[in-house]
C-alpha cells in the first residue's frame, strides 16, 4: 500500500473562516490502512479487489473518495462508517461488487458530507429500512445524499426474503423522508415488476432517474407530474407496451425531461394510438425514430412514428354465443 | 452552469499584499473545495493552496505558505487569496478553480475562473 | 514535490496526423496524472482525467494513456481547433504540480 505523505512541500492549517465561529484543527498526519491505496492530495482510497470483510477502521480524516469495491464485505452494519473524529468529509463512496448482502439501519449514520453512494453488484436481499435515513422516526433528519447508485442489487431468486424486492427497496428509498434531496436515482436492472406508485412523490428534488433493464410491463400507476426537476428518465430495456394518456400528459408537462424508451416490446395496437400522435409531436423523447413494435405479429419490427391510425386497429371482441372453441 | 469569476485590482506595487476575490455559481458552493492556481510566463502553471469552504481548512503549497492567506464566506458562496510582500516575481494570471462537476474532490479542475492579470510594479 | 515533464516543448503539425505528447513524473503518480487544453487568452479545460478517462466536452480524438511514472496524450486527426498549449498535471501528492506545457500549432 501506499500512502503518501503530507512532506515539506505543502502544508495544512485552519484558515480564517468567515461563516462559521466554530475553529478547525489541522489535520495530524495520517496513514493509509493496510491493504489500501491513498493519496491525500486526491482526498482519495482505494481497497479494491482486496477481498475485505469489514470496513477498514483506520481510514485517513481526510478521504473524500473512498473506493471499496470487489471486496467480501458481506454485511454493512450500524456505524459501518462511524469515526472519532468522524469522517467529516466523505464525500463519495462506491461499495459495488463487494458481496453485500445485509445493509443495517443505519450503515451510513456519522457521514454528514456523504452526496453519492454506490451499492450496485451487489445481491442484496437485505436492505433495512432506514439503511439511509438511520432512525425510524416518521420524519428523520434529512440525508445528504444526492447521489444512489443502486443498479444490480437484486439477489438471486432463492436468497429474496419472503416479501417484494421492489417494495424492500421502496422502503428505504421513502423512509422518514430523509432523501428528499436526491437528485440522481439509478436502480438499473433490478428485475423490478413495478414501480409502487408513491415512490416518486416522495423524492421530489429528482433530476436523473434510471429505471433501465428491468422487467416495468406498465407505468399506469406511476406519477411523474411533482417531479418538476427531472431532466432525464431511463426506461430502455423493459417490458412496456404502451404509455397511456395520462403518462404522457405528465411527461410532457416537465419542463427539462428527456425521455428514454428504447427497446421495449411496443404493442401497437388500438390502444398505442395516443402514444403514436404524442411521439410525432413530442420533442422529449430521444431516439425516438427508433422506436418499433413487437406485437402483434403482423406489426413486428414497425416505426412507431410511421403509424397511423388505419395501422391501429384491435381485433374484434366476439361475444360469448360466437366464440367458437 | 457552474462558473467562477475571480477579480481584484489589476497593479500592486512591490512589498504590498495582493487581494483576490473569487465568486462562484450554479453548484452548492460548500461541497467543493476551492483553489487557486497562477500562471506566468517564467514558472508555467503554479498551485497555490485550497481551502474547503465547509470548514476553513487550508493546505498550502510550501512555497506560499508563509505568504498566502485563503478565507471563505460561504454565506455569499466567495473565496478570497491575500498574497503578502509581493515582488515582481508574482505577476501573473490568478485563477480560482474547483471540481464542481464531481462530488469527490479528486485532485484536479473541472472548472476554472477565466483569471485575472495581476501585474506588480511600483 | 513531484516534478512533471513534458516533452517536446512545442509540436508543429500536419492536419490529419496523429500527436503524441508525453508526460513525466519524477516519481510514481499510479494514474493520478490530469490533462489541461489551453487556448490562447484562456483559461486551461480539462480534457483528460485519470490518465485515461476521457472528457464528454471533447472529442473521442484526444487518447490519454500510462500510469506510474509515464503518459501519454495522443490526438488523432489532428484539426486546427486543436491548436493550443497542453499541460499534465500530478493530482496524487503535495503540491498539486504542472509540467511545463507542450505548445501544439498546425504546418
Known amino acids: 500500500s501506499s500512502s503518501p505523505t503530507s512532506s515539506a512541500s505543502s502544508f495544512s492549517s485552519s484558515a480564517p473562516f468567515l461563516a462559521s465561529a466554530v475553529s478547525a484543527q489541522p489535520p495530524l498526519p495520517d496513514q493509509c490502512p493496510a491493504l489500501c491505496e491513498c493519496s491525500e492530495a486526491a482526498r482519495t482510497v482505494k481497497c479494491v479487489n482486496r477481498n475485505l470483510t469489514e470496513v477498514p477502521t483506520d481510514l485517513p480524516a481526510y478521504v473524500r473518495n473512498l473506493f471499496l469495491t470487489g471486496n467480501q464485505l458481506a454485511v454493512l452494519p450500524a456505524g459501518a462508517f462511524a469515526r472519532r473524529p468522524p469522517l467529516a468529509e466523505l464525500a463519495a463512496l462506491n461499495l459495488s461488487g463487494s458481496r453485500l448482502d445485509e445493509v443495517r439501519a443505519g450503515a451510513f449514520e456519522h457521514l454528514p458530507s456523504l452526496r453519492q453512494l454506490d451499492l450496485s453488484h451487489n445481491p442484496l436481499a437485505d436492505l433495512s429500512p432506514f439503511a439511509f435515513s438511520g432512525s425510524n422516526a416518521s420524519v428523520s433528519a434529512p440525508s445528504p445524499l444526492v447521489e444512489l447508485i443502486l443498479n444490480h442489487i437484486v439477489p438471486p431468486e432463492d436468497e429474496r426474503q419472503n416479501r417484494s424486492f421492489e417494495g424492500m427497496v421502496v422502503a428505504a428509498l421513502l423512509a422518514g423522508r430523509a432523501l428528499q434531496g436526491l437528485r440522481r436515482l439509478e436502480l438499473a436492472s433490478n428485475h423490478f415488476l413495478y414501480l409502487p406508485r408513491d415512490v416518486l412523490a416522495q423524492l421530489p428534488s429528482l433530476r436523473h432517474l434510471d429505471l433501465s433493464n428491468n422487467s416495468l410491463v406498465s407505468l399506469t400507476y406511476v406519477s411523474f407530474r411533482n417531479l418538476t426537476h427531472l431532466e432525464s428518465l431511463h426506461l430502455e430495456d423493459n417490458a412496456l407496451k404502451v404509455l397511456h394518456n395520462g403518462t404522457l400528459a405528465e411527461l410532457q408537462g416537465l419542463p427539462h425531461i428527456r425521455v428514454f424508451l428504447d427497446n421495449n416490446p411496443w404493442v401497437c395496437d388500438c390502444h398505442m394510438a395516443d402514444m403514436v400522435t404524442w411521439l410525432k409531436e413530442t420533442e422529449v423523447v430521444q431516439g425516438k425514430d427508433r422506436l418499433t413494435c413487437a406485437y402483434p405479429e403482423k406489426m413486428r419490427n414497425r416505426v412507431l412514428l410511421e403509424l397511423n391510425s388505419a395501422d391501429l386497429d384491435c381485433d374484434p371482441i366476439l361475444p360469448p354465443s360466437l366464440q367458437t372453441s | 452552469q457552474v462558473q467562477m469569476q475571480e477579480s481584484g485590482p489589476g497593479l500592486v506595487k512591490p512589498s504590498e499584499t495582493l487581494s483576490l476575490s473569487c465568486t462562484a455559481s450554479?453548484?452548492?458552493?460548500?461541497?467543493?473545495?476551492m483553489n487557486w492556481v497562477r500562471q506566468s510566463a517564467g514558472k508555467g502553471l503554479e498551485w497555490i493552496g485550497d481551502?474547503?469552504?465547509?470548514?476553513?481548512?487550508?493546505t498550502y503549497n510550501q512555497k506560499f505558505k508563509d505568504r498566502a492567506s485563503l478565507s471563505v464566506d460561504k454565506s455569499r458562496n466567495w473565496a478570497s487569496l491575500r498574497l503578502a510582500s509581493v515582488t515582481a516575481a508574482d505577476t501573473a494570471v490568478y485563477y480560482c478553480?474547483?471540481?464542481?462537476?464531481?462530488?469527490?474532490?479528486?485532485?484536479?479542475?473541472?472548472?476554472w475562473g477565466p483569471g485575472v492579470q495581476v501585474t506588480v510594479s511600483s | 514535490e513531484i516534478v512533471m515533464t513534458q516533452s517536446p516543448d512545442t509540436l508543429s503539425v500536419s492536419p490529419g496526423e496523429t500527436v503524441t505528447l508525453s508526460c513525466r513524473a519524477s516519481?510514481?503518480?499510479?494514474?493520478?496524472l490530469h490533462w489541461y487544453q489551453q487556448k490562447p487568452g484562456q483559461s486551461p479545460r480539462l480534457l483528460i482525467k485519470?490518465?485515461?478517462q476521457s472528457i464528454s466536452a471533447f472529442p473521442a480524438r484526444f487518447v490519454g494513456s500510462g500510469s506510474g511514472s509515464e503518459f501519454t496524450l495522443t490526438i488523432n486527426n489532428m484539426q486546427s481547433e486543436d491548436v493550443a498549449v497542453y499541460y499534465c498535471?500530478?493530482?496524487?501528492?503535495?503540491?498539486?504540480?504542472f509540467g511545463q506545457g507542450t505548445k501544439v500549432d498546425i504546418k
Open positions: 481551502i474547503n469552504p465547509n470548514n476553513g481548512v487550508t
Open positions: 498535471q500530478n493530482g496524487h501528492s503535495f503540491p498539486l504540480t
Open positions: 478553480a474547483t471540481g464542481a462537476i464531481h462530488y469527490g474532490y479528486d485532485g484536479y479542475f473541472d472548472v
Open positions: 485519470y490518465a485515461s
Open positions: 450554479g453548484y452548492t458552493f460548500t461541497d467543493f473545495y
Open positions: 516519481q510514481s503518480i499510479s494514474d493520478y
